[in-house]
């Protein structure tokens, strides 16, 4: 049975600033045919037929649901892209994470400007402070890592706070063992 394709993002963030670039790639096994990919944005068929969809100089209208389809194979699960205009943007490698999977958070400055005196918060409590900006890396997410995250920091010596972001860690499905 052919696998459903999967949409991946490069860079891996699904929340980006207006004006930034992101490439969506439709991954699946044995999809070697050229010009055989269908892309759907908010349900509408895109003109792009390559396995990668490049969003250059992102606009607010680029926000929304993206799905891809190879040949007559099922559509991929949707990926949601959100385009922001702000000073700070908290980005996550995923907003719904399977328990045991890694989770990365990034406090991203508009125009890629340096952000410093960065504090990451979870459910209103400070998690981590760095003078220079660093990503937060959770190697094995647990259900306790679920919560509302945001970051604060300085850009051009002025204080800013990102919009909050809800992260949900879900329990991995149990393997089913059948008695022989």
């Amino acid at each position: 049975v052919p696998q459903k394709p999967k949409v991946s993002l490069n860079p891996p963030w699904n929340r980006i600033f207006k004006g930034e670039n992101v490439t969506l790639t439709c991954n699946g096994n044995n999809f070697f045919e050229v010009s055989s990919t269908k892309w759907f944005h908010n349900g509408s068929l895109s003109e792009e037929t390559n396995s990668s969809l490049n969003i250059v100089n992102a606009k607010f209208e680029d926000s929304g649901e993206y799905k891809c389809q190879h040949q007559q194979v099922n559509e991929s699960e949707p990926v949601y892209l959100e385009v922001f205009s702000d000073w700070l943007l908290l980005q996550a490698s995923a907003e719904v994470v399977m328990e045991g999977q890694p989770l990365f958070l990034r406090c991203h400055g508009w125009r890629n400007w340096d952000v410093y005196k960065v504090i990451y918060y979870k459910d209103g409590e400070a998690l981590k402070y760095w003078y220079e900006n660093h990503n937060i890396s959770i190697t094995n997410a647990t259900v306790e890592d679920s919560g509302t995250y945001y970051c604060t920091g300085k850009v051009w010596q002025l204080d800013y706070e990102s919009e909050p972001l809800n992260i949900t860690v879900i329990k991995a499905p149990r393997e089913k063992y059948w008695l022989q």
Partner: antibody, heavy 121, light 110 residues
Framework: EVQLVQSGAEVKKPGSSVKVSCKAS????????ISWVRQAPGQGLEWMGR????????NYAQKFQGRVTITADKSTSTAYMELSSLRSEDTAVYYC??????????????WGQGTTVTVSS | QSVLTQPPSASGTPGQTVSISCSGS????????VNWYQQLPGTAPKLLIY???QRPSGVPDRFSGSKSGTSGSLAISGLQSEDEADYYC???????????FGGGTKLTVL
């Protein structure tokens, strides 16, 4: 490579104003900021203020507040520093410098050649 | 009077190591980074060290910076005659909401 080229030397009377320009060439102008720094004869460096052209935001050292105006013209990649009510103590070399927010954490990484302003009656 | 305090002069012989200190307070160096600038005679200043200890490309590794608490330090090893210059530390001051410089240190290579 980015270069900052400043306007020529000026001789001014006390009480008058001077406007010094700083033109950036060979790089992006508006994503950076321009600071102005002065150096009186035989003295150290003194930060006057800065402008972030893309935001149109300028801020000034308290000492010069109300007497200095820093502006920028994005279309010509030029920053300006105007100092009013000049007095003899304003005789100095005035430098513009690019403030780098890309990994330099707002250090001034490129400097203009300096503009000598002499205030004399 | 400068907000950041540097010794007015320093000296050394070729090959030696010299250090220049820069003392500030909790509102500047204590909470922000230190940058160092070199000004050769008759020229514009040049960025020498940024982010406390980083060298821009083209700056020899003989120059190194460090920060501890409310003080910064610039070390120059293997001193050369062309290092004779004025050296300035700089930081952002949160109380003043502005940039500040040290008074400068004149380095003489004997």
């Amino acid at each position: 490579e980015v270069q900052l080229v400043q306007s020529g030397a000026e001789v001014k009377k006390p009480g008058s104003s001077v406007k010094v320009s700083c033109k950036a060439s060979g790089g992006t102008f508006s994503s950076y900021a321009i600071s102005w720094v002065r150096q009186a004869p035989g003295q150290g460096l003194e930060w006057m203020g800065r402008i972030i052209p893309i935001l149109g935001i300028a801020n000034y050292a308290q000492k010069f507040q109300g007497r200095v105006t820093i502006t920028a013209d994005k279309s010509t990649s030029t920053a300006y520093m105007e100092l009013s009510s000049l007095r003899s103590e304003d005789t100095a070399v005035y430098y513009c410098a690019r403030v780098n927010p890309f990994g330099y954490y707002y250090a001034m990484d490129v400097w203009g050649q300096g503009t000598t302003v002499t205030v004399s009656s | 009077q400068s907000v950041l305090t540097q010794p007015p002069s320093a000296s050394g012989t070729p090959g030696q190591t010299v250090s220049i200190s820069c003392s500030g307070s909790s509102s500047n160096i204590g909470t922000n980074i230190v940058n160092w600038y070199q000004q050769l005679p008759g020229t514009a200043p040049k960025l020498l060290i940024y982010r406390n200890d980083q060298r821009p490309s083209g700056v020899p590794d003989r120059f190194s910076g460090s920060k501890s608490g409310t003080s910064g330090s610039l070390a120059i090893s293997g001193l050369q005659s062309e290092d004779e210059a004025d050296y300035y530390c700089a930081a952002w001051d949160d109380s003043l909401n502005g940039g500040i410089f040290g008074g400068g240190t004149k380095l003489t290579v004997l």
